[in-house]
């Protein structure tokens, strides 16, 4: 004999000894009907704020307050936003690798230094993790470009940076 709990909709719970679909109490939810209990809704407090409020069928979703970003599945923790010279990865804030920079506070990804030689210019000031290179005026007589080979710890993929 089919249990009538099987016909219960999400947002309800049902006990086998009394197979009646009952609505989830306040601050609880069930995304699958026919379960013996409803789940307690997640509360977004402290460094968290509500991204989506709880309903009888769906749990609440949290996001981090201004100045912080989510880490972990379903935003399980909040970490302070990245500083210039860093970019966000799953592990958190990671220093820009050699040949890349990020001058933004809290957002953005590490991007490659400008290749001055593309415009026939020399490097006036070397780049850092926080600042792009500064290109000088156009070079009149071109010297052959040299390739700096970046070690695997360097920029994405241990690639090469062209400088004059």
């Amino acid at each position: 004999v089919q249990n009538s709990c099987d016909n219960c909709q999400p947002g309800t719970f049902c006990r086998k000894y009394n197979p009646v679909c009952k609505s989830c109490p306040p601050s609880t939810f069930s995304s699958i009907g026919g379960q013996p209990n409803c789940n307690i809704c997640r509360v977004c407090a402290g460094y968290f704020r509500f991204k989506k409020f709880c309903s009888s069928t769906h749990n609440a979703e949290c996001e981090c307050i201004e100045g912080f970003h989510c880490l972990g599945p379903q935003c399980t923790r909040c970490e302070k936003d990245c500083r210039p010279g860093q970019e966000l990865t799953k592990q958190g804030c990671k220093t820009c690798s050699l040949g890349t920079f990020n001058d933004q506070n809290g957002t953005g990804v590490c991007r490659p230094w400008t290749n001055c030689s593309l415009d026939g210019r020399s490097v006036l000031k070397t780049g850092t993790t926080e600042k792009d290179v500064v290109c000088g005026p156009p070079v009149v007589s071109f010297s052959p470009s040299t390739t700096i080979s970046v070690t695997p710890e360097g920029g994405p993929g241990g690639h090469s940076l062209q400088v004059l």
Epitope: T89, K94, T114, P152
Partner: antibody, heavy 121, light 112 residues
Framework: EVQLVQSGAEVKKPGSSVKVSCKAS????????IYWVRQAPGQGLEWIGN????????FYGEKFMGRATFTADTSTSTAYMELSSLRSEDTAVYYC??????????????WGQGTLVTVSS | NVMLTQPHSVSESPGKTVTISCKLN????????VHWYQQRPGSSPTTMIY?????PDGVPDRFSGSIDSSSNSASLTISGLKTEDEADYYC??????????FGGGTKLTVLG
């Protein structure tokens, strides 16, 4: 609506070069990485390299260094990939893809339709 | 070299659940995000799961992603299989130099 539209199919002779274009629209072209990925017939996806169109900075996969060249024309929001010294193993569909600026290890949210490059004598 | 290994092919009947694994050979699967793409014949890849377990708008909730640090692998699970799910699926992550790495791809066949 974000779109990446690539140039048409090419047939090339071994030893020659090919230049594939990827025209971006619907977003600020200079603020997102463009990645180049290829797929040989019946094979998986292979990363070639990427470019930051904002300043033309490039990264190349070890396998393609010295043979691939990426450029970007910000006036037309178009990225280009040139592959030289072509050989039969370079026969593949070449894709451009955009990476969001959320994190350094993010996904590719938009892909071009692909450009088939056939290398045959 | 960092490698992501996927089964070459999996098959299951409509309505059933299938899981595609993506195993990292070195390093920690939890260190960098894992993403999943679906590719139908003659089409470009499209994102099914991004940042380990997130679904883009328009992707049905039959698709879910997870990370298992004990087996150092990621998984894509498709429940209530439909014939339209038949495609190649690729996992994608990064190595320590933020170089993209792709799995070899898994061909999903929906039987019947």
């Amino acid at each position: 609506e974000v779109q990446l539209v690539q140039s048409g199919a090419e047939v090339k002779k071994p030893g020659s070069s090919v230049k594939v274009s990827c025209k971006a629209s619907g977003y600020t072209f200079t603020s997102y990485y463009i990645y180049w990925v290829r797929q040989a017939p019946g094979q998986g996806l292979e990363w070639i390299g990427n470019i930051w169109p904002g300043n033309g900075g490039t990264f190349y996969g070890e396998k393609f260094m010295g043979r691939a060249t990426f450029t970007a024309d910000t006036s037309t929001s178009t990225a280009y990939m040139e592959l030289s010294s072509l050989r039969s193993e370079d026969t593949a569909v070449y894709y451009c893809a955009r990476r969001p600026d959320y994190s350094g290890d993010d996904y590719f949210d938009y892909w071009g339709q692909g450009t088939l490059v056939t290398v045959s004598s | 070299n960092v490698m992501l290994t996927q089964p070459h092919s999996v098959s299951e009947s409509p309505g059933k659940t299938v899981t595609i694994s993506c195993k990292l050979n070195s390093g920690n699967i939890g260190s960098y995000y894992v993403h999943w793409y679906q590719q139908r014949p003659g089409s470009s890849p499209t994102t099914m799961i991004y940042r380990d377990d997130k679904r883009p708008d328009g992707v049905p909730d039959r698709f879910s992603g997870s990370i298992d640090s004990s087996s150092n692998s990621a998984s894509l699970t498709i429940s209530g299989l439909k014939t339209e799910d038949e495609a190649d699926y690729y996992c994608h992550s990064y190595d320590s130099t933020i170089t993209p790495v792709f799995g070899g791809g898994t061909k999903l066949t929906v039987l019947g």
